[in-house]
């Protein structure tokens, strides 16, 4: 599949590959994300097309605000159906601060461990969804470098909703979230105008994640 997802005859289509992925989704659950239903709809639309299982794709979810919570580990569920049920039940934990570096670092150090289901030799993918600048951005550069050193592919999503609602400049925020994404940035960074628009990036994000299998 080419970068624009047109079928290229010389490469086997994405679905034919049986390569495994370990995917950890890092969700900003701070108070400013609204409505939370849009986040769960996004998760549903992204996850429902994945082949989830111990020998296929595994998915874990981490939520952060001021603190970090492992919603479920990579090896917790062994089917797409189970993951969808669990993802629907995830509520926003809230928090006045957005500790994005902490969320990413915890995912790297804890969610991607064998104890929590990560598999040796399997490609690691992190999807970070956030709606605001981090309160610990002084740590971001080091945290991202650590992810890079561990070959964790990162997709980052900036939700501009709270900025647009407050008529605030998004420039600094977008730059920060771009810095989280793997290179090339244009293939790994997404921004959406508000939470409701999250579903509009699902298909492109999904194909890009699965292009990593090829």
């Amino acid at each position: 599949v080419s970068p624009t997802f047109q079928v290229v005859n010389s490469i086997a289509p994405v679905q034919e590959c049986s390569t495994q992925l370990d995917i950890v989704i890092v969700l900003d659950g701070s108070n400013s994300i609204y409505p939370w239903d849009s986040v769960t709809a996004f998760l549903n639309d992204l996850l429902e097309r994945m082949d989830i299982g111990p020998k296929q794709t595994q998915v874990g979810i981490v939520q952060y605000g001021e603190n970090v919570t492992h919603e479920f580990n990579l090896n917790k569920y062994s089917s797409t159906e189970e993951v969808l049920v669990a993802a629907k039940k995830i509520g926003r934990r809230g928090g006045l601060q957005t500790m994005t570096a902490l969320g990413i670092d915890t995912a790297r150090k804890e969610a991607f461990t064998e104890a929590r289901g990560a598999r040796r030799g399997v490609k690691k993918v992190m999807v970070i969804v956030t709606d605001g600048e981090s309160h610990d951005n002084h740590r971001l550069k080091k945290v991202i470098q650590d992810c890079e050193d561990e070959n964790i592919q990162r997709f980052s999503i900036a939700i501009l909703g709270s900025y647009n609602r407050g008529n605030l400049s998004t420039e600094k925020f977008v730059e920060e979230i771009k810095s989280i994404a793997s290179e090339p940035t244009e293939k790994h960074f997404f921004n959406v105008s508000d939470e409701l628009a999250l579903v509009t990036i699902v298909k492109t994000l999904g194909e890009r994640i699965f292009a990593l299998e090829a």
């Epitope: 047109q6 034919e16 699902v202 492109t204 999904g206």
Partner: antibody, heavy 120, light 113 residues
């Protein structure tokens, strides 16, 4: 080459159920999503939903929720679409169709269609 | 859900003439970060299943004659047949695959004048 061969025409009474099959060949059946699209006589195309033959996962259009069931038998590379509580306006040609990619639903390969007539 | 509206509903064109069919979506199907429009065009002849002509709004499927072309962006799209041939008599449908559920236009019937 990819081929989707559907079961033959059916005549059903209102309130009954119909199960249409779609046998796939020429590719790895579990590797690609199968979609179902219907077309009432003289009308346009209506997407009904998809099944992931690998996991059995499904996504149904809201209009058909509760009435449609999509299943598959991987041992014979066949997908099925069952529609229950049939009404006269379910009279249509039902197509199975295969997508090229996992998330993008443009449909390159189509079955020949199965005419389902609902009449008392 | 995204609603797709085609115009005209039917048209009659002389052989060799250029013809255009329009399709409008109720919301944008443009993925702006890479300029991809999630739109496909199909041709359906009587008694046959639809045939994919174009995807990404303008990418011609392999084997489709180059007299067929697609254009447009966002919410407004056009299928153009540069020189109508007798075998082009059919119903043409647009389809968006930007958001689930994917949806089709109501169809445009093309006949020979």
């Amino acid at each position: 080459q990819v081929q989707l061969v559907q079961s033959g025409a059916e005549v059903k009474k209102p309130g009954a159920s119909v199960k249409v099959s779609c046998k796939a060949s020429g590719y790895t059946f579990t590797g690609y999503f199968m979609h179902w699209v219907r077309q009432a006589p003289g009308q346009g195309l209506e997407w009904m939903g998809w099944i992931n033959p690998n996991s059995g996962g499904t996504n149904y259009a809201q209009k058909f929720q509760g009435r449609v069931t999509m299943t598959r038998d991987t041992s014979i590379s066949t997908a099925y679409m069952e529609l229950s509580r049939l009404r006269s306006d379910d009279t249509a040609v039902y197509y199975c169709a295969r997508s090229v990619l996992r998330y993008f639903d443009w449909l390159l390969w189509w079955g020949q269609g199965t005419l389902v007539t609902v009449s008392s | 859900d995204i609603v797709m509206t085609q115009s005209p509903e039917s048209l009659a064109v002389s052989l060799g003439e250029r013809t255009t069919i329009n399709c409008k979506s109720s919301q944008s199907v443009l993925f702006s970060s890479n300029n991809e429009n999630h739109l496909a065009w199909y041709q359906q002849k009587p008694g046959q299943p639809p045939k994919l002509l174009i995807y990404w709004a303008s990418t011609r499927e392999s084997g489709v004659p180059d007299r067929f072309s697609g254009s447009g962006s966002g919410t407004d799209f056009t299928l153009t047949i540069s020189s109508l041939q007798a075998e082009d008599v059919a119903v043409y449908y647009c389809q968006q695959y930007y958001i689930t559920p994917c949806s089709f236009g109501q169809g445009t019937k093309l006949e020979i004048k």
